[in-house]
């Protein structure tokens, strides 16, 4: 029996992100004796829910039981059955559902009984479900990125866990972009954070930290699109809306009563003398970028700096970690490497935004053609929100990580919720024990 | 469908507590705060409190403090209300009422059917 | 503690009239935080109105709110007779408080 493996003595959770413009099931997988350790946790599956957010399921509540179920099954199936009862599932949902919540609570609230509902038929112990704020948003995503990257770890390591890793124990900052807000967060040096709405304090493994965070609702990358399509089409002077953010020679019709649908578009809601109109792209960057500047109003500002729309933002400290739609966006434009400068992200922009649709579509015979489209926007306006919105510089750039995962585990908030809920982060340094125990015997 | 189902009506003496159960259905417990308002004969309602199920947090209206409690069962689904050093004026129909899930706002969805507590020597 | 004002304290209508009910706030209510209930005999309260204006699910279009700061009005366009019953507007401000009702009975 010398070299006989026990059976796994590990711990599971789950964790569905109810996003703007779709819903993901991670699992993640940890060993139960070390649960207080940094960096055990990770994850083990993320399963994307076919189809929208669950914020696009108010006229069909019904339809969300089957909407989940295929990443439920297959949780089943990854989490051993003996472990079921005693996994918790925990659903987060975020801008999109906060959204919806602003234009009828009692809509949000319907949706998520129902989400409740169904995923309480499931073996496991399901904890609720629930529309986190866009500072937990912030926050989690903060510690989810320094969990992995080890900078919670009082262990001074020679080693480098990620090619980008600094070997200090500065935290790094969290740059996240979603469909319907996006969170800016990170340790500032020696700042006071002048606004408290701003201000985050937490004490993880005997180290103090104080936090700045914000979260721009309505600035996700799709609801900015939306933004700047209901701000341009005040001054068309007809319904052909020539658009610089899409490629010369793509043509798409939209629906008024779409583009007045969100709440983030009411204030450039006006009557106009047509019920639709036409996007006809002109693939012009510069252009593009002055249309998106126009939503940032930087005109005012109370503290002694801002981002934009009155929000405090204190200098810029430190590596930043993009991730989530900052991450997808860059790496389908192969922009991700370290080594390119802000200066060559600019170019190669402007040369992709140029390029003709017919053009495109062949290049990317693969890709959905509604997310193909709107790369170009997408690109301009990452660099248009972390230039002009958060005030990096063509210096500070190579201050940005796109990270996609890190050690296997997908960079996002969930991570950092589940660890925060299951009591998995302690506030002191936990006591190491002389030897850990052994998975043989 | 959510219901909320009262315990039965008390007659209690002066001095004396009063310990109100409510249990709720047709929805996740923990998801929502409950609230207990109050009404007596021939008057308006008056708000005593609420308690959110999820971590057993309350917030008591001035009035009642030191004499209210609110304590949930996830168990069972069920809220409490206990009212001690009970007097006349404390004769009243006692409602839960379901209030909002978290960043949501203050109003009451749904009502259970009352509980008549009578004060009297 | 924000002390709700209702006007009048009993409104005497027959069905098919229009009913206007007032709620006066000592200081101002974010709309949000203002809804109005309608209670019968023998019965529990009853949500219409959250929100100032908007309606809660299954309540007829006849009722309607409106609004802001410290002037809110319940209007119930054409009175049924199932309509007959107590009014009370509530709102929050760290702690919710009712008015003290306007009885709506038949003239």
């Known amino acids: 029996t010398q070299n006989k493996a026990l059976p796994e003595n590990v711990k599971y959770g789950i964790v569905l992100d109810a996003g703007s413009s779709h819903t993901s099931l991670y699992i993640y997988k940890w060993p139960a004796e070390k649960e207080n350790d940094t960096g055990v946790v990770h994850q083990v599956e993320e399963c994307r829910v076919k189809g929208p957010g669950i914020s696009k399921f108010v006229q069909k509540v019904n339809a969300i039981g089957i909407y989940l179920t295929a990443c439920m099954e297959r949780a089943r199936e990854v989490i051993p059955r003996s472990q079921h009862q005693e996994t918790p599932v925990y659903l987060g949902a975020t801008a999109g559902m906060r959204l919806l919540r602003m234009e009828s609570e009692e809509l949000a609230d319907r949706v998520l009984d129902v989400v409740e509902r169904s995923l309480s038929n499931y073996p496991f112990d399901f904890q609720g479900a629930r529309i986190i704020t866009g500072q937990e948003e912030g926050a989690y995503g903060w510690i989810t990125i320094n969990y992995l990257l080890g900078k919670f770890s009082q262990k001074t390591r020679w080693f480098s866990i990620v090619p980008y890793e600094t070997n200090n124990q500065e935290t790094f900052g969290a740059l996240d972009l979603g469909g319907a807000s996006t969170q800016v967060t990170f340790v500032p040096q020696n700042q006071t954070i002048e606004s408290p709405d701003n201000a985050l304090q937490f004490r993880l493994y005997g180290k103090d930290y104080n936090v700045y965070t914000h979260s721009f609702l309505c600035y996700g990358k799709d609801q900015a699109l939306w933004q700047k399509l209901a701000k341009d089409i005040q001054v068309a002077s007809n319904e052909i809306l020539r658009d610089p953010c899409f490629h010369p020679g793509y043509k798409k019709v939209v629906n008024v009563s779409d583009l007045y649908k969100t709440p983030c578009t009411k204030r450039f809601e006006m009557t106009l003398p047509f019920q639709q109109f036409e996007i006809q792209g002109i693939g012009n960057y510069q252009q593009c970028h002055q249309s998106i500047l126009e939503l940032f109003n930087t005109s005012y500002c109370p503290y002694s700096q801002c981002a934009f729309n009155g929000i405090f933002l204190p200098p810029l400290q430190g590596d930043f970690g993009a991730f989530s739609a900052f991450y997808f966006v860059m790496k389908f434009l192969n922009l991700t490497s370290e080594k390119v400068s802000q200066e060559k992200v600019t170019e190669m922009m402007k040369k992709f935004c140029a390029q003709p649709w017919e053009e495109i579509k062949t290049s990317y015979a693969g890709v959905k053609e509604k997310y193909l489209s709107e790369y170009c926007f997408s690109g301009t306006y990452i660099l248009s929100l972390l230039l002009q919105g958060y005030h990096f510089t063509a210096d500070s750039w190579e201050h940005i990580h796109f990270i996609g995962k890190i050690q296997g585990s997908d960079a996002g908030w969930t991570l950092g919720y589940m660890l925060n809920l299951t009591n998995m982060i302690p506030a002191e340094q936990p006591l190491s024990t002389p030897l850990s125990h052994s998975t043989y015997v | 469908q959510v219901q909320l189902v009262q315990s039965g009506a008390e007659v209690k003496k002066p001095g004396a507590s009063v310990k109100v159960s409510c249990k709720a259905s047709g929805y996740t417990f923990k998801s929502y705060e409950m609230h207990w308002v109050r009404q007596a004969p021939g008057q308006g309602l008056e708000w005593m409190g609420r308690?959110?199920?999820?971590?057993?947090?309350?917030w008591y209206a001035q009035k009642f403090q030191g004499r209210v409690t609110m304590t949930r069962d996830t168990s069972t689904s069920t809220v409490y209300m206990e009212l001690s050093s009970l007097r006349s004026e404390d004769t009243a129909v006692y409602y839960c009422?379901?209030?909002?899930?978290?960043?949501?706002?203050?109003?009451?969805?749904?009502w259970g059917q009352g509980t008549l507590v009578t004060v009297s020597s | 503690e924000i002390v709700l004002t209702q006007s009048p304290g009993t409104l005497s209508l027959s069905p098919g009239e229009r009913a206007t009910l007032s709620c006066r706030a000592s200081q101002s209510v974010a709309s949000s935080y203002l809804a109005w209930y309608q209670q019968k005999p023998g019965q529990a309260p009853r949500l219409l109105i959250y929100?100032?204006?908007n309606r809660h699910t299954g309540i007829p279009d006849r009722f309607s709110g409106s609004g802001s700061g410290t002037d809110f009005t319940l209007t119930i366009s054409r009175l049924e007779p199932e309509d007959f019953a107590v009014y009370y507007c509530?709102?929050?401000?760290?702690?919710?408080?009712f008015g003290g009702g306007t009885k709506v009975e038949i003239k």
């Open positions: 308690i959110n199920p999820s971590v057993g947090s309350t």
């Open positions: 929100g100032a204006s």
């Open positions: 009422a379901r209030g909002k899930r978290e960043g949501g706002t203050e109003y009451l969805r749904k």
């Open positions: 509530q709102q929050y401000h760290n702690a919710i408080t």
